[in-house]
């Protein structure tokens, strides 16, 4: 049957903890993704901003399991009104502050 | 100021009974979820039960499980725990302690009474 | 039930770094809380979150949690930071809170 949504946000954050801890060089060679706005639609948003990140294995099960959490499909290049246009993070920086802020919303029950 | 006032503690002897009581003032008790902590002497902090702020839930740790039980009265700001079956290793200072509440009680622990000596000996 | 582990003692000089760790099973995935404990008093909020500090707490304070270690770091040691230091997070299998062993800081 389906994951739970809880079930499923608490395998996203042990994701995020394991790409965090495992970093020998750079995350996804430095690269660079665009900031996102943490409120509503975070989740695609986070997609739309990690999908542009190609050839970097450490991320790709992220990738898959964000889309589990957006409603619709996403594609390389799309952008929604939740990214900080004018900010560019490196990629490891982007996990650590969607990594805690998941963990916020896991202790407040926001599961979806 | 933002307050929490334990009473109630005192030495009691193995296999009876203690009611803890904690006054807080100062801060509107009805939203918070309220804990217990406790310190044996020389050791270290011992996390012993939780309610919710509206009173729906309770956890307890396995220690004390089956004999302490955890209530609040929002209508007069006051916690309490009730001590059952006490046993020489219950012996410790008790500490009231609020915590803001989400859906899980996993907030940081930000207001501390300065807590109150049980004793339990023969 | 969820264990964290943390080292008895840490000692440092004035002015030094002071570093205490708390150990635990995917510890990153949890939001970890820190405080201290002077002696004869009751325990005090220094960290929340992770890495979140209350305002009353100096900057010198900070927390970070990667992977299976919490880290408490305190800048720049005082004499008056010399306490116990206890790490805490909730342990959501079991829906009860869980206090590290503690560590105790000694300013040479």
């Known amino acids: 049957g389906p994951v739970p949504p809880s079930t499923a946000l608490r395998e996203l954050i042990e994701e995020l903890v394991n790409i965090t801890q495992n970093q020998k060089a750079p995350l996804c060679n430095g690269s660079m993704v665009w900031s996102i706005n943490l409120t509503a639609g975070m989740y695609c948003a986070a997609l739309e901003s990690l999908i542009n990140v190609s050839g970097c294995s450490a991320i790709e099960k992220t990738q898959r399991m964000l889309s589990g959490f957006c409603p619709h499909k996403v594609s390389a290049g799309q952008f929604s009104s939740l990214h900080v246009r004018d900010t560019k993070i490196e990629v490891a920086q982007f996990v650590k502050d969607l990594l805690l802020h998941l963990k916020k919303l896991f202790r407040e029950g926001q599961f979806n | 100021q933002m307050q929490l006032v334990e009473s109630g503690g005192g030495v009691v002897q193995p296999g009876r009974s203690l009611r803890l009581s904690c006054a807080a003032s100062?801060?509107?008790?009805?939203?918070?979820?309220m804990h217990w902590v406790r310190q044996a002497p020389g050791k270290g902090l011992e996390w012993v039960a939780v309610?919710?702020?509206?009173?729906?839930?309770?956890h307890y740790a396995d220690s004390v499980k089956g004999r302490f039980t955890i209530t609040r009265d929002n209508s007069k700001n006051t916690l309490n725990l009730q001590m059952n079956s006490l046993r020489a290793e219950d012996t410790a200072v008790y500490y009231c302690v609020r915590a803001p509440q989400w859906y899980l009680t996993a907030e940081a622990f930000d207001l501390w009474g300065q807590g109150t000596m049980v004793t339990v000996s023969s | 039930s969820y264990v964290l582990t943390q080292p008895p003692s840490v000692s440092v000089a004035p002015g030094e770094t002071a570093t205490i760790t708390c150990g635990g099973n995917?510890?990153?995935?949890?939001?970890v809380h820190w405080y201290q404990q002077k002696p004869g008093q009751a325990p005090v909020l220094v960290i929340y979150d992770d890495s979140d500090r209350p305002s009353r707490i100096p900057e010198r304070f900070s927390g970070s949690n990667i992977g299976n270690t919490a880290t408490l770091t305190i800048e720049r040691v005082e004499e008056g930071d010399e306490a116990d230091y206890y790490c805490?997070?909730?342990?959501?299998?079991?829906?009860?809170?869980?206090f590290g062993g503690g560590t105790k800081l000694t300013v040479l």
């Open positions: 805490q997070v909730w342990d959501y299998s079991s829906d009860h809170m869980v």
């Open positions: 309610i919710w702020d509206d009173g729906s839930n309770t």
């Open positions: 995917l510890i990153g995935a949890r939001l």
């Open positions: 100062g801060f509107e008790f009805r939203t918070y979820g």
